[in-house]
Interface confidence: low
Amino acid sequence: GITIPRNPGCPNSEDKNFPRTVMVNLNIHNRNTNTNPKRSSDYYNRSTSPWNLHRNEDPERYPSVIWEAKCRHLGCINADGNVDYHMNSVPIQQEILVLRREPPHCPNSFRLEKILVSVGCTCVTPIVHHVA
Amino acid sequence: GITIPRNPGCPNSEDKNFPRTVMVNLNIHNRNTNTNPKRSSDYYNRSTSPWNLHRNEDPERYPSVIWEAKCRHLGCINADGNVDYHMNSVPIQQEILVLRREPPHCPNSFRLEKILVSVGCTCVTPIVHHVA
């Protein structure tokens, strides 16, 4: 692959654990303006597999607030507005990166952490397992 | 709110931009074992609003690989397996944090960036707008 030369203007790393410990500017470059998922779309209500959004807060994590989706039904909403159990509402999950304060309560020292969050729900055809 | 005292074992911050610039340990604590979304579930294929997963790679970003969902159809799959345009397949989007190398090509200096990614698709009842 292409090797990109190191930028001569990079900060020096004086940390013994380098390259595991790096400097991160927390002044976020945000390409998006809307951070409240309830405002950004009403899909959670209009979906055939609707979900509720739960606020998960943790002051030792950055971002401290994460919204978690929980499917409202086991089945999916059919054309008549009823729950159809021939189909299943399932959460769509994604691994995201967060920063965890380490050591705890430190304002300027973090460790990267991967967590699995449910973003919304989708309606799937169930896998029917036949009993042997 | 509760004020948590600063841990006396925290690293000192000698950076003029503190608290914007922090130390981050990239040795990820991963609570999940499966990182390939295609392996983690086959919902993308079984959904009534199926999607394809596209690999988005950027060596200046951490993580360098992100999977983006694109809905396969404008409508949703009905019980007969046909696309039904009385319903709409829509992407479920989420803001995630990534690290962007800053200055570019630096191995040990990053800036936090928020990006919007499509995680999967869900089937929604359309908002039917009457033409004025």
Partner: antibody, heavy 118, light 110 residues
């Protein structure tokens, strides 16, 4: 009242680029999918591209795939079409349209003329 | 991709009824909505029928749409023709990832 106003058309040489804009008003822009449709002089309508209300899904006609990019800025109520590697056959009036539902162009702008010629 | 085929032109006298057909080359027309657009000379198109047979408010009830699954075709019927109906008419439908217009039919009101 729904209003769609296209701009950015003009004369460009083959291989050149142009960015069309469509300023929308009179409705909640982010709730609607939007499309671009073009019409070559004396010819019929040709669908070019569509984008979902959130901007998360985009679709293109085969004739423009890889050359044109549709995007939207919901904070500015504006739809865009970035056109690169333009060809003579891209010469047309370009209309932006608000979709009733996906692919159903309920309201149209008055169009902007793009001429690709050396 | 599929195609939508329309007659190049049709003509009829004022007060009469005219029907414009639109045939889909492949894929069931019944699975996808059909729209009809009117375009008068020098103007942008306007929708006259959407979702096979739905009429937007402001469009006279002289305009109606239908589909025939057996022939995989759609029709636009305009009754009690008026001179102001003279225009080009386009049918339009979908495939899963794209939108397709018919070639257009020029309606002349004699």
């Amino acid at each position: 009242e729904v209003q769609l106003l296209e701009s950015g058309g003009g004369l460009v040489q083959p291989g050149g680029s142009l960015r069309l804009s469509c300023a929308a008003s009179g409705f909640t822009f982010s709730s609607y999918a939007m499309s671009w449709v073009r019409q070559a002089p004396g010819k019929g309508l040709e669908w070019v591209s569509a984008i979902s209300g959130s901007g998360g899904s985009t679709y293109y006609a085969d004739s423009v795939k890889g050359r044109f990019t549709i995007s939207r800025d919901n904070s500015k109520n504006t739809l865009y079409l970035q056109m690169n590697s333009l060809r003579a056959e891209d010469t047309a009036v370009y209309y932006c349209a608000r979709d009733l539902i996906w692919g159903v162009a309920g309201s149209w702008g008055q169009g902007t003329m793009v001429t690709v010629s050396s | 991709n599929f195609m939508l085929t329309q007659p190049h032109s049709v003509s009829e006298s004022p007060g009469k009824t005219v029907t414009i057909s639109c045939t889909r080359s492949s894929g069931s027309l019944a699975n996808y909505y059909v729209q009809w657009y009117q375009q008068r000379p020098g103007s942008a198109p306007t929708i006259v029928i959407f979702a096979n047979n739905q009429r937007p408010s402001g469009v006279p009830d002289r305009f109606s749409g239908s589909i025939d699954s057996s022939s995989n075709s759609a029709s636009l019927t305009i009754s009690r023709l008026k001179t102001e109906d003279e225009a080009d008419y386009y049918c339009q439908s979908y495939s899963p990832h794209s939108v397709v217009f018919g070639g257009g039919t020029k309606l002349t009101v004699l």
